[in-house]
């Protein structure tokens, strides 16, 4: 009789995460009698994956019926593969021993590589809003992919960005990887409706990249421009003064009228009109009783926008 050999025909097997891995192994003889065991890794720290005789291994099924006479096929299937299952698997024949079985012969090993899809990219912007002409940073993160090779691109409104830095971790061998990228974006007044997109391409995605988006509306603050104008006298001794608050974003705005430095009225922007670019316009008016004033009146429209320091515009009202 020729001595038993353990044959693992596949040097490597590539499986997608969530699927089933088939690890093939055959023996060339029934003798010596004893169990086949599967291990991940070699040496004293190896991990037992399956023992034909002892223990329960719910994720593992055998390809053939091991109880069939003359069975020499000890191939196994491992279900619901995750990146953590990657490694080299050895089919090892043991000789029945008393009290313990004795390792007899090992197969050459099969390297299991797991293809895992990256998680949906998550794009996050700065904690505080910034105004046009400022440069802001956006980060994009995606995790759990394998193999390591991955491509990340940034876009703003469909235009590819070039000012970004990307890292894939860890640098060395790992069961799965993460990508982290930071892009720099210069804001413009027209960016309320703009989007920043992070696009991740990986072999597991079959040419259909994953995208994460951030709306610049959550990042930008467009400060208002103010214009105070005096309208013709509406009624006897009454002058209508308007304050046009234009092109601001976001909507959160409080306006205060001052007469000669004294607060006359405070109101919060409510019925605003929206511009095509996503900014808002609002108008406030003040009816001034001229007869109540002997001297010229300095009217000030003071606007506090989105919690920022107030901006103001004044108008001198002539009392003739």
């Amino acid at each position: 009789e020729e001595e038993l050999q353990v044959i693992q025909p596949d040097k490597s097997v590539l499986v997608a995460a969530g699927e089933t891995a088939t690890l093939r192994c055959t023996a060339t003889s029934l003798i010596p009698v004893g169990p086949i065991q599967w291990f991940r890794g070699a040496g004293p720290g190896r991990e037992l994956i399956y023992n034909q005789k002892e223990g329960h291994f719910p994720r593992v099924t055998t390809v053939s019926d091991l109880t069939k006479r003359n069975n020499m096929d000890f191939s196994i299937r491992i279900g619901n593969i995750t990146p953590a299952d990657a490694g080299t698997y050895y089919c090892v024949k043991f000789r029945k021993g008393s009290p313990d079985d004795v390792e007899f012969k090992s197969g050459a090993g099969t390297e299991l590589s797991v293809r895992a899809k990256p998680s949906a990219p998550v794009v996050s912007g700065p904690a505080a809003r910034a105004t046009p002409q400022h440069t802001v940073s956006f980060t994009c993160e995606s995790h759990g992919f394998s193999p390591r090779d991955i491509t990340l691109k940034w876009f703003k409104n469909g235009n590819e960005l070039s000012d970004f830095q990307t890292n894939v971790d860890p640098v060395g061998e790992s069961v799965s990887y993460s990508i982290h990228s930071t892009a720099k974006v210069v804001l413009t007044r027209e960016d309320v409706h703009s989007q920043v997109i992070c696009e991740v391409a990986h072999v597991t995605l079959q040419g259909d990249p994953l995208r994460g988006t951030a709306n610049l509306s959550e990042t930008i603050r467009v400060p208002p421009t103010l214009e105070v104008t005096q309208q013709p006298v509406r009624a006897e001794n009454q002058v209508n003064v308007t304050c046009q608050v234009r092109k601001f974003y976001p909507q959160r705005l409080q306006l205060t009228w001052l007469e000669n430095g004294n607060v006359s009225r405070t109101e919060t922007a409510s019925t605003v009109t929206e511009n095509k670019d996503g900014t808002y316009n609002w108008m406030s008016w003040l009816l001034v009783n001229v007869s109540a004033h002997r001297d010229d009146v300095k009217l000030t429209c003071q606007v506090e926008h989105d919690g920022q320091p107030a901006v103001s515009k004044s108008h001198d009202l002539k009392v003739s």
């Epitope: 029934l30 003798i31 009698v33 034909q52 005789k53 002892e54 223990g55 329960h56 019926d65 091991l66 109880t67 069939k68 006479r69 003359n70 029945k96």
Partner: antibody, heavy 121, light 111 residues
């Protein structure tokens, strides 16, 4: 350490019923076929019955002499195998051994100490 | 059923000599190049103990003075050199097909 311990033997009258039990320890019971073999001075060693694994749908096989009268069963959660014997005859007398089949081929590597059944009026 | 005939029914062998026990099957117990024959030793008050599996392979923990040979229908158990503790009854058993059957036994006495 592998152990097989039979119980349930005794003296029975012909036509009676008896159930033998065997509790296993020291190995993963559910991974092994189990057998009953009996021994008497008249017939020597005689294989009686076999029960296979859950994956074999607990298939059972019997010697012709006990077919229809004996039933082998197992409870993997209790690591136990049983032999229900009905319509007992004098020729069923003997020592009944509970046996582990190591390699699914009547490879009887571990035997219990046996339990004695006597069928006599 | 396959009938196994053992011979001799008993034998006496001097310490250190060779004991040879024969087992003949009424039909071949060989398939796919393997011989489904087993040998057991039984001492009084004890269950049988497996010595040889698949005709010629020594069960773990069994001394190397026990050996098995044969194929098809003719099989032999050899014990050499015989020791005092080998006094027992020896049985052959097949698993060529169902039902499994045993030989009638050979009683070995040590002189």
């Amino acid at each position: 350490e592998v152990k097989l311990e039979e119980s349930g033997g005794g003296l029975m009258q012909p036509g009676g019923s008896m159930k033998l039990s065997c509790v296993a320890s020291g190995f993963t019971f559910s991974n092994y076929w189990m057998n009953w073999v009996r021994q008497s001075p008249e017939k020597g060693l005689e294989w009686v019955a076999e029960i296979r694994l859950k994956s074999n749908n607990y298939a059972t096989h019997y010697a012709e002499s006990v077919k229809g009268r004996f039933t082998i069963s197992r409870d993997d959660s209790k690591s136990s195998v049983y032999l229900q014997m009905n319509n007992l005859r004098a020729e069923d007398t003997g020592i009944y051994y509970c046996i582990r089949d190591y390699d699914y081929d009547a490879y009887f590597d571990y035997w219990g100490q046996g339990t004695t059944l006597t069928v006599s009026s | 059923d396959i009938v196994l005939t053992q011979s001799p029914a008993s034998l006496a062998v001097s310490l250190g000599q060779r004991a040879t026990i024969s087992c003949r099957a009424s039909k071949s117990v060989s398939t796919s190049g393997y011989n489904y024959m087993y040998w057991y030793q039984q001492k009084p008050g004890q269950p049988p103990k497996l010595l040889i599996y698949l005709a010629s392979n020594l069960e773990s923990g069994v001394p190397a003075r026990f050996s098995g040979s044969g194929s098809g229908t003719d099989f032999t158990l050899n014990i050499h050199p015989v020791e005092e503790e080998d006094a027992a009854t020896y049985y052959c058993q097949h698993s060529g097909e169902l039902p499994y059957t045993f030989g009638g036994g050979t009683k070995l006495e040590i002189k």
